[in-house]
Interface confidence: low
């Protein structure tokens, strides 16, 4: 067993003095732990020498010397106490990690052992302890929190009575860390994969535990399998990781992967499917009929599913007309990825103006081909009405133009009075035309229709009104006479009232 | 003796920044443990935290007010400032400042507001 | 944020009585409570600390308890200048939160 001069068990020096530190052994011998820079180490011998020439109460600690060559193990320790009157504490560490229940050692050493009466462990800015927070305290180790807690993860400071006073030590963040108790955490991943025949796969289940006992497998269909497993340690857990790779898949790989881990407290497994195909592929689908009527000034938002493998190489949306070459703005187009293989292209079409109207493409493009899928979108208009008087064969006739789309139905009414619109408690006769004349009927345009109504002689105190509607709305025109009895009238002699 | 008031703008507008300054005595924002927080209470309503400034510069905010909050000391002419940006006219209260004072307990010193300012009114009004 | 609930809003009773006010925290504060007193016009006074701990300067009437959750300041021989708005503080977290204050008349 080594010894060391002075022999110890504690050595109290005061700041700036000399102190050497000196171990002595059978065979060869070493000091433990990393030594501070503050520190110059030498051999002389069979020993070993630590030595500072101004000690400082970063000095304060434990000093441990082994001599590796003992069979027994044996070990000597000498605990140094540099008082600085001004700095009654050296932190080892200004954080701990352990878990809960387990015993967290707050490393605060006192530097003047004299001090060790009036120490006590507070909360930072000097809160008290939690209740049932259960502690003791070495003057070698400093704070042991004993079975610590979730709820005890803080920070904490270490109090010494210096002359009245208490004086705190920097703070030192516990953290406590939960146990779950339940059986290992498991990933699988990918969550899904495809690959065309003869393409290389790789499947990768790994696991986690807090202790190294458990156990991992992946399994295929029901067969399992054997893989090299490759263990590691961090953040604090055990990890296991089996890591399937296929050179060149064929179709007997398809199918479910599952991913099992097991401990004493039970079994966890989560499974994917993987599907080998022939060749690449690209579908296209739209929740939305693709024949699509919007009232004008609304806006809309067109949808398309993609399913795709290998992924895509190029997509975008495009106007196939008529109106303009106007093309979608970029910004307007939103792409979205369900999982790996599907994916959603939202085209956003907000207050839409009538050159707007037309067929919208959305094209894709992956190594299996392009795929397009084309949107027809057709305006609503409510209608727009103009009457005028005209001559048609010698007659006088009423001429109403309406327009919009759906194509609007037309009615005429004849009332008393001279009015901008007919109130139903004025009406004197309605007539109704079921087949107003089709005059302009395009794609993606408002449907123009045309209805007369032949009158002999107008009556100068009343009004003659053409009322168009659709699903959209209405529109009508009054026309109001000036001079009566006349039975051909020429426009300019008529007040015309929109 | 330990006194603070508080001083401010008394009215200002919406969009506007609010600045208030803290003048104490009888206690130094250097002492080990010593703080200064800010407290408000809107007229006929409750008291609502808003900051705290720490002997060591450590500085805690409301985060329902954190990104509109500054808290800072001048401690050569023992004062504390609060600065809240973009008011409006919720913000209308009263504003007080009170020490964090360092109280004996027996197993180690513990911290309350101690001593209030009188409080200083402010009306954000367009 | 932890929410502090206080009971009740406004209170009457008469010289030499006692009364109780509670506040009620939406979880555990570990006794990280104060109490405080405010008249019109001025600004508050802090009565306890630490749940139960009395300020100096403050008449041995007042005191506090609780634990957990639940917390009271009782008033014992009511005298007329306790005439009052009383309000619990928590610091337990951040942000501190404020009871919503109880107002005791004297009849």
């Known amino acids: 067993i080594p010894v060391i001069e002075p022999s110890g068990p504690e050595l109290v020096v005061k700041p700036g003095e000399t102190v050497t530190l000196r171990c002595v052994g059978n065979g060869s011998v070493e000091w433990d732990g990393p030594i501070s820079p503050h520190w110059t180490l030498y051999s002389d011998g069979p020993s070993s020498v630590l030595t500072t020439n101004n000690a400082t109460f970063q000095n304060t600690r434990t000093y441990r010397c082994t001599e590796p060559g003992d069979p027994l193990g044996g070990s000597a320790a000498i605990h140094l106490y540099v008082k600085d009157p001004a700095r009654p504490w050296n932190v080892l560490a200004k954080e701990v990690v352990v878990f809960e229940d387990q015993d967290a050692l707050l490393p605060c050493l006192l530097t003047d052992p004299v001090l060790e009466a009036g120490v006590s462990l507070v909360r930072l800015r000097g809160r008290p302890l939690l209740r049932h927070t259960n502690y003791s305290f070495s003057p070698w180790h400093g704070f042991i929190i004993h079975r610590a807690k979730f709820i005890q993860g803080q920070d904490y400071q270490c109090s010494a009575l210096m002359g009245g006073r208490k004086v705190m030590s920097i703070s030192i963040r516990l953290k406590v860390q939960k146990v779950i108790p339940g059986p290992p955490a498991l990933t699988l991943v990918p969550a899904e994969l495809v690959r065309i025949r003869g393409e290389a796969a790789q499947i990768v289940c790994s696991a986690s535990n807090i202790d190294v006992d458990f156990d991992v497998f992946l399994q295929h269909n029901t067969t399992k399998l054997a893989i090299p497993q490759r263990s590691d340690f961090h953040d604090n857990r055990y990890q296991k990781v089996l890591t399937l790779s296929l050179g060149q898949v064929d179709f007997q790989h398809a199918g479910n992967y599952s991913c099992v881990a097991s401990n004493v407290q039970g079994k966890h497994s989560t499974s994917m499917f993987f599907q080998v195909v022939e060749s690449a592929y690209l579908d296209l689908s739209s929740e939305q009929n693709l024949i699509q009527e919007v009232t004008v000034g609304e806006g809309l938002n067109l949808k398309v599913m993609v399913e795709a493998y290998p992924g895509l190489q190029g997509f975008n949306w495009t106007y196939l007309g008529p109106f303009s070459d106007h093309q979608p703005e970029p910004k307007l187009a939103n792409a979205t990825t369900k999982d790996t293989y599907r994916h959603t292209f939202t085209l956003s079409l907000p207050r839409l103006k009538p050159s707007e109207a037309g067929r919208y493409s959305f094209l894709a493009r992956n190594p299996g081909g392009w795929r397009a899928l084309t949107f027809e979108l057709t305006l609503r208009y409510p209608p727009e009405v103009s009457v005028i008087w005209t001559s048609i064969n010698g007659s006088g006739t009423l001429l109403c133009a309406a327009s919009g789309y759906p194509q609007p139905n037309v009615t005429w009414l004849q009332c008393a009075g001279h009015t901008d619109r007919c109130d139903e408690a004025q009406v004197l006769q309605v007539w109704v035309d079921p087949h107003p004349e089709v005059l302009s009927q395009e794609p993606f345009q408002k449907v123009t229709v045309q209805s007369l109504l032949t009158a002999e002689t107008l009556e100068h105190n009343q009004t003659y009104e053409c009322r168009a509607h659709n699903s959209v709305g209405s529109g009508s025109w009054a026309f109001i006479p000036i001079s009566a009895g006349a039975r051909t009238h020429p426009p300019d002699e008529f007040l015309f009232t929109p | 003796q330990v006194t603070l008031k508080e001083s401010g703008p008394g009215i200002l507008q919406p969009s506007q920044t609010l600045s208030l300054t803290c003048t104490f005595s009888g206690f130094s924002l250097t002492t080990y443990g010593m703080g200064v927080g800010w407290i408000r209470q809107p007229s006929g309503k409750g008291l609502e935290w808003l900051a705290n400034i720490w002997w060591d510069d450590d500085k805690y905010y409301n985060p329902s007010l954190k990104n509109r909050l500054t808290i800072s000391k001048d401690t050569s002419n023992n004062q504390a400032f609060l600065k809240l940006t973009n008011v409006h006219t919720s913000d209308s209260a009263t504003y007080y400042c009170?020490?964090?004072?360092?109280?004996?307990?027996?197993?180690?010193?513990?911290?309350?507001?101690?001593?209030w300012g009188p409080g200083t009114m402010v009306t954000v009004s367009s | 944020d932890i929410q502090m609930t206080q009971s009740p809003a406004s209170l009457s009773a008469s010289l030499g009585e006692t009364v109780s006010i509670e506040c009620l925290a939406s979880?555990?504060?570990?006794?990280?409570l104060a109490w405080y007193q405010k008249k019109p016009g001025k600004s508050p006074h802090l009565l306890i600390y630490?749940?139960?701990s009395l300020q100096d300067g403050v008449p041995s009437r007042f005191s506090g308890s609780g634990s957990g959750t639940q917390y009271s300041l009782k008033i014992n021989s009511l005298e007329s200048e306790d005439a009052a708005t009383y309000f619990c503080?928590?610091?337990?977290?951040?942000?501190?939160?404020f009871g919503g204050g109880t107002k005791l008349e004297l009849k």
């Open positions: 503080l928590q610091d337990s977290e951040y942000p501190w939160t």
């Open positions: 009170a020490r964090i004072g360092p109280i004996k307990y027996p197993t180690a010193p513990y911290r309350y507001f101690d001593f």
């Open positions: 630490y749940a139960s």
């Open positions: 979880e555990d504060i570990y006794d990280n």
